[in-house]
Amino acid sequence: TGADTEAVVCAGTACYTAHWGKLSAAEAQNLCLQNGGNLATVKSEEEAQHVQQVLAQLLRREAALTARMGKFWIGLQREKGKCLDPSLPLKGFSWVGGGEDTPYSNWHKELRNSCISKRCVSLLLDLSQPLLPGRLPKWSEGPCGSPGSPGSNIEGFVCKFSFKGMCRPLALGGPGQVTYTTPFQTTSSSLEAVPFASAANVACGEGDKDDSQSHYFLCKEKAPDVFDWGSSGPLCVSPKYGCNFNNGGCHQDCFEGGDGSFLCGCRPGFRLLDDLVTCASRNPCSSSPCRGGATCIPGPHGKNYTCRCPQGYQLDSSQLDCVDVDECQDSPCAQECVNTPGSFRCECWVGYEPGGPGEGACQDVDECALGRSPCAQGCTNTEGSFHCSCEEGYVLAGEDGTQCQDVDECVGPGGPLCDSLCFNTQGSFRCGCLPGWVLAPNGVSCAMGPVSLGPPSGPPDEEYKGEREGSTVPPAATASPTRGPEGTPKSTPTTRRPLLSSDAPITSVPLEVLAPSGSPGLWREPSIHHTTAASGAQEPAGGDSSVATQNDDGTDGQK
């Protein structure tokens, strides 16, 4: 990338240089960095045109254009581990020098979907064709290359150097040559704008004569945002030419004096600046240079201007337009931040509400608070949520898990709880016996009793009636098969002692459904579940112990 093939374009507040070189993206970026720049950004169509201009310069310097495609690195890259994001204009890529993502893009084709590898972007050029202003180079993404292996068709790179301001090119009022040396070590004689801190070497004269004089100037910031050379009057003036050479070096009007001297002047509405060459608008804001809601503020002495944005907006890279500030980048909220035009708002996650110390803070909503509990029975508040629980004998139900449903212990997975008949109740169950049998004191077994016809018998008295234990059942859990039936004293949790009290749902039974005397028989009452007889139950002589069971498919079957 020698100086003999330098190409440079300066515009706005930046200069672009284009270079030949089969280098990796990292090597190219290092070369740009060495001179205080970065691989170029292409954040707008205007910037794309500047980059195209500098590439056109570079291609003109190539003696013979070859019929091939060539790629030139720009500063758009996606780091390892950052995935392609089709929802964004830059597809998850970002500019190496930093700065905001912009809506402009010019992708060549659909991008390769990847996350693992670092990916870099180059401008794709047909090196056999002259660059046309209407056809801006397309962006091509691919591997970033490595030293000695830059990647396929990589021919060079474009750097960008940003400055606080620019000086106008020096205008000569007579024959001479200006050579600019920029802070990024480029020399040029044809810059449309010259960056701050550049040096200008002016050699006056025809060049082949000995009457040449040399002048040396520096582009300085004369006042805030006012940049000029500190020269006064046109350079290399010659009475021989007067206003006829390059308009005397004047920006607008040139007035000749009778003695061969001349002066520069300005048109109505403009005034002559301190360099006695350049004209500036009396009101620099008269041309409405600021856009996007920005306010134009004239600079001192009617020179230059600055654009100012309303609160919540900031100037973009052109310093003329306002773009929304994404306040959410600074994480001002405790939980969720929503950026809005000119502002932002904080939101809380489900289960939280605004409140607590600090701006944008969120506090847990106590869903279990008095009067707002969504649960039918137990409610436990948790951070950002809650969960419902049920008393023993119930399980969580309902599509949102807030209701409690009675567990039918008589069909529980733990096997039979009663030796003969089982009656489900709200939150519990009771045992009973078939005609001719009575419930044993343990409330579970059946013992042979006086023969009688009628409904199944319950326990002999109320002595076992006790409180049901109030421990909760975890969500989706089933009732423990070891839990005793209603009426079991707490002191004997291992013994199942069901109770059939006077309010038990028993209906009288027609004689024809009863089994022959002396047999436990089959009790077919829809609300009653039959279980296998316990081994301890007495069996009448000569009688079969025929017991009803419930099959897995929910139908009754006889064992």
Partner: antibody, heavy 120, light 108 residues
Amino acid sequence: QVQLQQSGADLVRPGASVKLSCKASGYTFTDYEMHWVKQTPVYGLEWIGGIDPETGDTAYNQNFKGKATLTADKSSSAAYMELRSLTSEDSAVYYCTNYGNLYYYAMDYWGQGTSVTVSS
Amino acid sequence: ENVLTQSPAIMSASPGEKVTMTCRASSSVSSSYLHWYQQKSGASPKLWIYSTSNLAFGVPARFSGSGSGTSYSLTISSVEAEDAATYYCQQYSGYPLTFGSGTKLEIK
């Protein structure tokens, strides 16, 4: 259509190494990354790492660095995972997977899995 | 690493019921990078919902997904027998990719 065909089940001795293969078909092999996932009853699904066949670049879960090495062979359109210094903890089903044309690491295609049993 | 916690671990539902399972992340996840997989016994996982709410090809419309930040959920509006499976959430917010421990859905 995209298919990922994995090598058969392996029974290996503790301390040994094993190399699992995943042959891709139905697409251009270098277009999609290939990732590997381990499944055990205790730890469920664990991402081991991935490889970009175009560049050979890899990304690993720190928990598997030194245990797994990922490679890809463009000529045979196959991805490989070598597991070394095997212990009973490495007994698992291993899947190769990729996200095809979907974005954001949504794994759209999965191999049938290779069961590795480490036992003496 | 970003740990995903799924709840409940096991759930049971009758056909026609609506069910919701949740996935909580230990740190925020972009909704684009949160996905759900269905796995049936002896089979490979299948992508079921991608980028929080997009149904993968062939997934019935009774499935839906929602969420943002650290809290995400998968809902089945009316469960069918064929939905019995284990559902895993998965996220990417920088390496490593992580999966949830799964929610096993049983049909009564």
